[in-house]
């Protein structure tokens, strides 16, 4: 009996540019002789329904149809036909099929590959055109994929040390697509510093599919109102 097992759950998630290993384990009733077996990996894009051959291994030869694609002959000996794809790109997401032939038997399995890119986040202070005692803080998230992202603002005061979500005076702009397929978005928080307690900690919280835990950027309101020079206006706050 010949059986193929892919990633549990049928989906693998990998970071953009990573060297991804798409799992495919072979279960066979006898020891595997790699010189008399064949492995073929196929890929079907998310946008087109056409299947494309990615890699082929048979007997004493292997061929990569995608640069760098490889199945390890040394791992194949112990039943591991996993496909290594170095420098994975967003457009390589989709369905991957592992087909194993041990004549006359044939088995196959499929897995969905999702490619994600984590956002980078930074805080900026924009005082241009703002009224006295008014500040605009911008939280820029860039280089993320997929497009769905959640940006919120929170504050902690000495009176209320637990974070409180801010819903007023928050404007989140549209997501902008970059040339490489990733996205950027900016969320703005308008503050009237005269109405806020010095020592209040504000946080921009970014949640995205690529992140295990939310990305947090914060600043603390000081007694003296912020007055940043032009160059400081693009600096990150810790």
């Amino acid at each position: 009996d010949l059986k193929v097992e892919m990633m549990a759950g049928g989906t693998q998630i990998t970071p953009l540019n990573d060297n991804v290993t798409i799992f495919c384990n072979i279960f066979y009733s006898q020891p595997l002789n790699i010189t008399s077996m064949g492995i073929t990996w196929f890929w079907k894009s998310l946008t087109f329904d056409k299947e494309v051959k990615v890699f082929e291994f048979f007997g004493d030869h292997q061929e990569a149809f995608r640069p760098g694609a490889i199945v390890s002959p040394w791992r194949l000996k112990s039943g591991d036909a996993s496909l290594r794809l170095p420098g994975i790109q967003l457009e390589e997401a989709g369905e991957y099929r592992c087909e194993v032939v041990v004549t006359p038997l044939k088995a196959q399995g499929t897995v969905q590959l999702e490619v994600v890119a984590s956002p980078a986040s930074r805080l900026l202070l924009d005082q241009v055109g703002m009224k006295e005692n008014e500040d605009k803080y911008m939280c820029e998230s860039s280089g993320f994929y997929p497009e769905a992202i959640n940006i919120t603002w929170e504050k902690q005061t000495q009176k209320f040390p637990h974070p409180i979500e801010i819903s007023e005076d928050v404007i989140t702009g549209p997501t902008i697509k970059n040339m490489d397929g990733t996205f950027n978005v900016t969320s703005c928080l308008k503050l009237n510093s005269s109405q806020e307690d010095p020592g209040t900690v504000y946080q921009c919280v970014v949640r995205h599919a690529s992140l295990h835990t939310p990305l947090r950027s914060n600043f603390t309101l000081t007694a003296a109102r912020h007055s940043l020079s032009e160059t400081e206006k693009t600096d990150n706050f810790s």
Epitope: N19, T21, F23, N25, D60, H61, Q62, I70, S72, P73, W74, R75, K77, S78, G79, D80, S82, R84
Partner: antibody, heavy 120, light 111 residues
Framework: EVQLVQSGAEVKKPGASVKVSCKAS????????MDWVRQAPGQGLEWIGD????????LYNQKFRGRVTLTVDKSISTAYMELSRLRSDDTAVYYC?????????????WGQGTTVTVSS | DIVLTQTPLSLSVTPGQPASISCKAS??????????MNWYLQKPGQPPQLLIY???TLHSGIPDRFSGSGSGTDFTLKISRVEAEDVGVYYC?????????FGQGTKLEIK
């Protein structure tokens, strides 16, 4: 920085078993196989076998088959080599080594070695 | 099993002079256009360290005075200018077939 840290020296009686551990750090544990190699006093290197941490698949040198068991614990990035029915000629330094398996096959990082002495 | 025979078994070299070690395999270690021959150096009291893999590729961090060549059954490790730190035992290893086997070792000492 890639590091392989092995357990300490062992003294065993003939017929007993020994289990050597190899804790890996500084790389993705499942991306490489773990080789085990031994070296008897004043002798050359002898390949025992290897294990694929991805699926637990093992390949053994026939010479040791039935006496050696290679295992891994992925959760703590640790590989183990257990040798049973020890004989005096099993006295050696036992090494674990990280093995590249996709773009060639070679051991690029080695543990410091574990001395196993079998004596009655 | 593939048997690897190294020659010479020992050599004594003056610093700055070249050195060469041969490794002959009992059968070809080539597969799909690549040669699965590796070279290691074991310095006294240390584990082996990788020098060359796939017959001729220098491992990262290894000085370029080391070079490897050959294919099929005949392989050579060359040191263009031997230095005091090169002392130890040099091993060839084939990784084409299991069991992976090593040569018996070549001991290099400084004159």
């Amino acid at each position: 920085e890639v590091q392989l840290v092995q357990s300490g020296a062992e003294v065993k009686k003939p017929g007993a078993s020994v289990k050597v551990s190899c804790k890996a750090s500084g790389y993705t544990f499942t991306d490489y196989n773990m080789d085990w190699v031994r070296q008897a006093p004043g002798q050359g290197l002898e390949w025992i076998g290897d294990i694929n941490p991805n699926n637990g698949g093992t390949l053994y040198n026939q010479k040791f088959r039935g006496r050696v068991t290679l295992t891994v614990d992925k959760s703590i990035s640790t590989a183990y080599m257990e040798l049973s029915r020890l004989r005096s000629d099993d006295t050696a330094v036992y090494y674990c080594a990280r093995s590249e398996v996709f773009y060639g096959n070679y051991a690029d990082y080695w543990g410091q070695g574990t001395t196993v002495t079998v004596s009655s | 099993d593939i048997v690897l025979t190294q020659t010479p078994l020992s050599l004594s070299v003056t610093p700055g002079q070249p050195a060469s070690i041969s490794c002959k395999a009992s059968q070809s270690v080539d597969y799909d256009g690549d040669s699965y021959m590796n070279w290691y150096l074991q310095k006294p009291g240390q584990p082996p360290q990788l020098l060359i893999y796939a017959a001729s590729t220098l491992h990262s961090g290894i000085p370029d005075r080391f070079s490897g060549s050959g294919s099929g059954t005949d392989f050579t490790l060359k040191i263009s200018r031997v230095e005091a730190e090169d002392v130890g035992v040099y091993y060839c290893q084939q990784s084409k077939e299991d069991p992976r086997t090593f040569g018996q070792g070549t001991k290099l000492e400084i004159k």
